[in-house]
């Protein structure tokens, strides 16, 4: 039962234009272009989008018109390759244009940059934003899509349309409010934070598909959907997994029109069949399309059916285990994963996948043994340590978080991870450790039954950020090893890393620890980042420094910043007191 239309269309571009409507078509083409050509000015992209849209309209009017039968990759690739400054701006990416489809699109995909050299987005004054919004609402919203898409080249395009809709609603409401800032700023903060989280989650899905293949993604999807829809039958979950895999494969592959169209079809199918999927979908299914799709993606787990039978009966005690496994290995393992996941909403998806991998490895070994049943009879006993490891880790870290609070917990992780992989760039270590530290406030408040899925699956998303950033400029074999060996064992791999004894400490550079009065005007978050940057650098200079030594230096540093920010002549204070601080810190750390 495939939900996607299989009928051939003379013109793919006309088909998608009609399905999606002009507004969504234009928005998705803009996102696609901005995600490919991340450095191009906004105006250039708008021009390209308008040209593609006009062409699509001619195809809607006559599907047999010239070039209307071309694939979307061909049409879009040809359009991107008309950009005059391609070689100057993008260097070797221009070589993609010499290739034919599908190699050309693959080439563009390979040149997507997870960390583009773009200025930080600075939020203008509220009045300035509201004026811009009222002056030209369409351009204002397009600019939002463009700025997010070019900074997040794997952002889930149909979900970005949903963010843009909320962005528009926020300005529509708040620009008429008495206190515009009080109304608008919290909404924008929420959209920014949710947007970053959404981008990171999607980046993991794309990494899963691109680095580990469709089978890995499908396994993830079986586990997650089985937790979410435990009343659905295996055939239903399998069907949803197949369709969801198609949607994400398309989006990760830059096929954004097909992706958005198929996602809408999938939401429609789910809502038409909610009786056999989940009792929690009713509210979602009453919403408009973009909200509906988002709501379904975030829907809470349905209640587990009563009277679920023992898993051991079919997967351990049965004499037919090896026969069933041999007949259809992936289907049998899929059923195992489905049955285990629907019984364990309290487990992380990655833990469930580790259990399934252990089960698979055991069957591979035992089904070739003289007495298979005797060999695999104790397989469930092998699960115990795998379950206990994340449980214990989460317990310990939540205790540490509750004791320290978020900022100091982040600092503890900064020190821990800098010692594990000191070769990684300081900005990456700061960004990743800060995000790892957010697991505390995000997950430790939950009861035991929700902690592990919250924490470990979130950590998978954050560690993927480390992996994709490191892949761009690899500097550590240990990071490469943890990132590439096993998707589901990334977190245990990083957790198991000890201090890198081979690391040669960084030469001391006073400039790194020189601060100026501008730190006083920074937001609390920015000030924390400055201090955390200094902490990473300290550890890189002195990897063997003790917690106590580092704490003492950081306390002195905090006091120094506070003192100088209160001084009349701030800059002089920073210059003079800064020298003293550096000298004292060197002495304290024996540098």
């Amino acid at each position: 039962r495939g939900v996607f239309r299989r009928d051939a269309h003379k013109s793919e571009v006309a088909h998608r234009f009609k399905d999606l409507g002009e507004e969504n078509f234009k928005a998705l083409v803009l996102i696609a272009f901005a995600q490919y050509l991340q450095q191009c000015p906004f105006e250039d992209h708008v021009k390209l989008v308008n040209e593609v849209t006009e062409f699509a309209k001619t195809c809607v009017a006559d599907e047999s018109a010239e070039n209307c039968d071309k694939s979307l990759h061909t049409l879009f690739g040809d359009k991107l390759c008309t950009v005059a400054t391609l070689r100057e701006t993008y260097g070797e990416m221009a070589d993609c244009c010499a290739k034919q489809e599908p190699e050309r699109n693959e080439c563009f995909l390979q040149h997507k940059d997870d960390n583009p050299n773009l200025p930080r987005l600075v939020r203008p004054e509220v009045d300035v934003m509201c004026t811009a919004f009222h002056d030209n609402e369409e351009t204002f919203l397009k600019k939002y899509l463009y700025e997010i898409a070019r900074r997040h080249p794997y952002f889930y395009a149909p979900e970005l349309l949903f963010f843009a809709k909320r962005y528009k609603a926020a300005f529509t409401e708040c620009c008429q409010a008495a206190d515009k800032a009080a109304c608008l700023l919290p909404k924008l903060d929420e959209l920014r934070d949710e947007g970053k989280a959404s981008s990171a989650k999607q980046r993991l899905k794309c990494a899963s598909l691109q680095k580990f293949g469709e089978r890995a993604f499908k396994a993830w999807a079986v586990a997650r959907l089985s937790q979410r829809f435990p009343k659905a039958e295996f055939a239903e979950v399998s069907k949803l997994v197949t369709d969801l895999t198609k949607v994400h494969t398309e989006c990760c592959h830059g096929d954004l029109l097909e992706c958005a169209d198929d996602r809408a079809d999938l939401a429609k199918y789910i809502c038409e069949n909610q009786d056999s999927i989940s009792s929690k979908l009713k509210e979602c299914c009453e919403k408009p399309l973009l909200e509906k799709s988002h709501c379904i993606a975030e829907v809470e787990n349905d209640e587990m059916p009563a009277d679920l039978p023992s898993l051991a009966a079919d997967f351990v005690e049965s004499k037919d285990v090896c026969k069933n496994y041999a007949e259809a290995k992936d289907v049998f393992l899929g059923m195992f994963l489905y049955e285990y996941a629907r019984r364990h909403p309290d487990y992380s998806v990655v833990l469930l996948l580790r259990l399934a991998k252990t089960y698979e490895t055991t069957l591979e070994k035992c089904c070739a043994a003289a007495d298979p049943h005797e060999c695999y009879a104790k397989v469930f006993d092998e699960f115990k340590p795998l379950v206990e490891e994340p449980q214990n880790l989460i317990k310990q870290n939540c205790e540490l978080f509750e004791q320290l609070g978020e900022y100091k917990f982040q600092n503890a992780l900064l020190v821990r991870y800098t010692k594990k992989v000191p070769q990684v760039s300081t900005p990456t270590l700061v960004e990743v450790s800060r995000n790892l530290g957010k697991v505390g406030s995000k997950c430790c408040k939950h009861p035991e039954a929700k902690r592990m899925p919250c924490a470990e699956d979130y950590l998978s998303v954050v560690l993927n950020q480390l992996c994709v950033l490191h892949e761009k400029t690899p500097v550590s074999d240990r990071v490469t090893k943890c990132c590439t060996e096993s998707l589901v064992n990334r977190r245990p791999c990083f957790s198991a890393l000890e201090v890198d004894e081979t690391y040669v400490p960084k030469e001391f550079n006073a400039e790194t620890f020189t601060f100026h009065a501008d730190i006083c005007t920074l937001s609390e978050k920015e000030r924390q980042i400055k201090k955390q940057t200094a902490l990473v650098e300290l550890v890189k200079h002195k990897p063997k420094a003790t917690k106590e030594q580092l704490k003492a230096v950081m306390d002195d540093f905090a006091a120094f910043v506070e003192k100088c920010c209160k001084a009349d002549d701030k800059e002089t204070c920073f210059a003079e007191e800064g020298k003293k601080l550096v000298a004292a810190s060197q002495a304290a750390l024996g540098l």
Epitope: F234, D307, L308, P309, S310, L311, A312, A313, D314, F315, V316, E317, S318, K319, D320, K323, N324, M335, E339
Partner: antibody
Framework: EVQLVESGGGLVQPGGSLRLSCAAS????????MGWVRQAPGKGLEYIGI???????YYASWAKGRFTISRDNSKNTVYLQMNSLRAEDTATYFC???????????????WGQGTLVTVSS | DIQMTQSPSSLSASVGDRVTITCQSS????????LSWYQQKPGQPPKLLIY???DLASGVPSRFSGSGSGTDFTLTISSLQPEDFATYYC???????????FGGGTKLTVL
């Protein structure tokens, strides 16, 4: 009272289809594999197949393709769908509860009274 | 297909007699012991007497016993009672659940 009750039998023409039901009461079907066995008039017992607690199905070679066993744990019922029926399928059809959960041990310790299926034109 | 051969196919005996019925399979049963015995009376469903070759099912009198391993099995009734006159079937479980099979039956009648 713990019991199994078959229903859905009757007269059917050759080539026709029939769906038999087996309703359990006094216990949950989700804890055991459930099998179907038939007995032609005056003849011996013949194994048709079984469905495990997790829904895995196993059929005698002669039954594969024509007969399908399914279960609905929420209704505490097991079904036997029979297609392309022939005169030689005329028999009393029993459902039975196996001692095992995940496979057929051949040890059925609870049986229904059976339902008669007659295939005739 | 796996064959289960029961002998004799019919047997006459008197109350108090010791009776033995044998069952032979064309292949070894699973774990060498997955063999059951049933009793069936006219108009009734079968009743499980013995499972795993020698284990007595719940509520079955101790005059019934089973033995054997691999391919050869025996059901023994140590002292026939009037209610024991019925048809007896063996059933074997094999390495695949698809291969479960019943013997042809042994009809035990009053001499």
């Amino acid at each position: 009272e713990v019991q199994l009750v078959e229903s859905g039998g009757g007269l059917v023409q050759p080539g026709g289809s029939l769906r038999l039901s087996c309703a359990a009461s006094g216990f949950s079907l989700s804890s055991n594999a459930m099998g179907w066995v038939r007995q032609a008039p005056g003849k011996g017992l013949e194994y048709i197949g079984i469905i495990s607690v997790g829904g895995f199905t196993y059929y005698a070679s002669w039954a594969k393709g024509r007969f399908t066993i399914s279960r609905d744990n929420s209704k505490n019922t097991v079904y036997l769908q029979m297609n392309s029926l022939r005169a030689e399928d005329t028999a009393t059809y029993f459902c039975a509860r196996d001692r095992h959960g995940g496979d057929s041990s051949g040890a059925f310790y609870l049986w229904g009274q059976g339902t008669l299926v007659t295939v005739s034109s | 297909d796996i064959q289960m051969t029961q002998s004799p196919s019919s047997l006459s005996a008197s109350v108090g007699d010791r009776v033995t019925i044998t069952c032979q399979s064309s292949e070894s049963v699973y774990s060498n012991n997955q063999l059951s015995w049933y009793q069936q009376k006219p108009g009734q469903p079968p009743k499980l007497l013995i499972y795993d070759a020698s284990d007595l099912a719940s509520g079955v009198p101790s005059r019934f016993s089973g033995s054997g391993s691999g391919t050869d099995f025996t059901l023994t009734i140590s002292s026939l009672q009037p209610e024991d006159f019925a048809t007896y079937y063996c059933a074997g479980g094999f390495s695949s659940s698809s291969d479960t099979a019943f013997g042809g039956g042994t009809k035990l009648t009053v001499l």
